[in-house]
């Protein structure tokens, strides 16, 4: 739910201001060059203007700021720090602005920032302290409630020599600053795994989107503490089966709805518990659409229509009987 601005009367800054550099402090409510502003809607849009840095002269009234489709490259510490501060800025959208580095404290001095969208930026370097602003073991709580990080994985040749999952999780967990986060979107990031401690430290989550990644297993992930979780999107991953521990944890969450479409389910003897659970649970949305991908003889069979006799495993032959 990105910030919207239904109110009209956007004013654009005059073209001749575009290259002007003022030594004077900006007028409090002027509109930055190359942007459109609506004081009535408390909205500033600097969209598809190839900006290379965040405008310094943002109006103090701004509540919704769109800086999408630019060429920002780096977001330095205090990128939005102003005097007086942008005290009302609640929604900040930086998607598709070619950011490859977000430094520690990039979002400091934004006391009302509830919603941040960094999607579609190739973030090769996301500081662990990008959201917490400090390297203290326990930071001041971030005001963020919604954090949208879809498709922030950089091309493989631009990644640092470290786990991309680890880099993102470090930023999410630093200083326990994001304990109030309620929506987290991490879709389309080629995640192979989910570090086991990440969800335990985000207890307020209501919506978690991990769709279109490459998750193979949830065996070491615990959902137990996520009492308030309402939607868990796991569509379009590489999940083969959900094991008993995961099934029990999901079933124990009072409000959860899980989305599991388009995973390559392996319908062998290890799938028996999941099939039994699927037949009984109301947790999974669209469960009648889940189909087997493997083994070949089971391809496209509907999971809900399987019985235990269908779910067999090829016996493992003792070594003396195995052929090379």
């Amino acid at each position: 739910s990105s910030p919207t601005s239904s109110a009209s009367s956007f004013s654009s800054s005059a073209p001749f201001l575009a290259s002007a550099v003022s030594a004077q402090p900006p007028l409090p409510d002027q509109c930055p060059a190359l942007c459109e502003c609506s004081e009535a809607a408390r909205t500033v849009k600097c969209v598809n203007r190839n900006l290379t840095e965040v405008p310094t002269d943002l109006p103090a009234y701004v509540r919704n700021l769109f800086l999408t489709g630019n060429q920002l490259a780096v977001l330095p510490a205090g990128a939005f720090a102003r005097r007086p501060p942008l005290a009302e800025l609640a929604a900040l959208n930086l998607s598709g602005s070619r950011l490859d580095e977000v430094r520690a404290g990039a979002f400091e001095h934004l006391p009302s920032l509830r919603q941040l969208d960094l999607s579609h930026n190739p973030l090769a370097d996301l500081s662990p302290f990008a959201f917490s602003g400090s390297n203290a073991s326990v930071s001041a709580p971030s005001p963020l409630v919604e954090l949208i990080l879809n498709h922030i994985v950089p091309p493989e040749d631009e990644r640092q020599n470290r786990s991309f999952e680890g880099m993102v999780v470090a930023a999410l967990l630093a200083g326990r600053a994001l304990q109030g986060l309620r929506r987290l979107e991490l879709a389309s990031n080629h995640f192979l795994y989910l570090p086991r401690d990440v969800l335990a430290q985000l207890p307020s989550l209501r919506h978690l989107d991990l769709s279109n990644n490459s998750l193979v297993s949830l065996t070491y992930v615990s959902f137990r503490n996520l009492t308030h979780l309402e939607s868990l999107h796991l569509e379009d991953n590489a999940l083969k089966v959900l094991h008993n521990g995961t099934l029990a944890e999901l079933q124990g969450l009072p409000h959860i709805r899980v989305f599991l479409d388009n995973n390559p389910w392996v319908c062998d003897c290890h799938m028996a518990d999941m099939v039994t659970w699927l037949k009984e649970t109301e947790v999974v949305q669209g469960k009648d659409r889940l189909t087997c991908a493997y083994p070949e003889k089971m391809r496209n069979r509907v999971l809900l229509e399987l019985n235990s006799a269908d779910l067999d495993c090829d016996p493992i032959l003792p070594p003396s009987l195995q052929t090379s």
């Epitope: 109030g180 919506h207 309402e230 939607s231 409000h255 109301e282």
Partner: antibody, heavy 118, light 113 residues
């Protein structure tokens, strides 16, 4: 258009029952919590009950046992079954949608009037 | 039983005045921030003004502001306009092991002086 609309109010005798309905349109009920709030004439707002997206229900202490909230996601309907009605249940009953992120009532119907009288 | 107490219960003010309404909860609201303010005019449904203690709802004029945390909250109207004369309610959301609970304050009627 996103809206909620109540119906089913009317005159009922003490001890009687009534079922209120709330038609939700423009959004999916399975994704939102829905609530009933009431207001007696000249009085303040009073929370009655709430139902979560997946159907868990919660009630004000005074409503437990007499009132039941339910919904039909496919039909886009929320219901409030009221039993053992008393004169003090006379009020305008509002249906309200809860934000998907915050626990606040961000969309209200215009209300339906329930009168309990002999 | 959770109680939300608003003060004053009623007040008279003039156009252009700065008005403050307080709301005190007998228990901390969920996450210390889950308090909302609504405006209601006679014969109409309530309208959301402020949520999460201080966030203005869409389309609400910036003369309205909210503050506070935990159990004590304030609604401020910086410069009263004729259309602001109405009744204002605070609403808290609460969570415990037994589930969710919501409560409203008794209301503050803002009248023209």
């Amino acid at each position: 258009e996103v809206k909620v609309e109540e119906s089913g109010g009317g005159l009922v005798q003490p001890g009687g029952s009534l079922r209120l309905s709330c038609a939700a349109s423009g959004f999916s009920l399975s994704s939102y919590w829905m609530s009933w709030v009431r207001q007696a004439c000249g009085k303040g707002l009073e929370w009655v009950s709430i139902i979560a997206g997946r159907g868990s229900t919660y009630y004000a202490s005074w409503a437990k046992g007499r009132f039941t909230i339910s919904k039909d996601n496919s039909e886009g309907m929320v219901y409030l079954q009221m039993n053992s009605l008393r004169a003090e249940d006379t009020a305008v009953y509002y249906c309200a949608r809860v934000s998907s992120i915050y626990y606040t009532f961000n969309l209200w119907g215009q209300g339906t009037t329930v009168t309990v009288s002999s | 039983e959770i109680v939300l107490t608003q003060s004053p219960s009623s007040l008279s003010a003039s156009v252009g005045d700065r008005v403050t309404i307080t709301c005190q909860s007998s228990q901390s609201v969920y996450s210390n921030n889950e308090l909302s303010w609504y405006q209601q005019k006679p014969g109409k449904a309530p309208k959301l003004l402020i949520y999460y203690a201080s966030t203005l709802a869409s389309g609400v004029p910036s003369r309205f502001s909210g503050s506070g945390s935990g159990t004590d909250f304030t609604l401020t109207i910086s410069s009263l306009q004729p259309e602001d004369f109405a009744t204002y309610y605070c609403q808290g959301s609460y969570y415990s092991g037994s589930g969710w609970y919501y409560a409203f304050g008794q209301g503050t009627k803002l009248e023209i002086k």
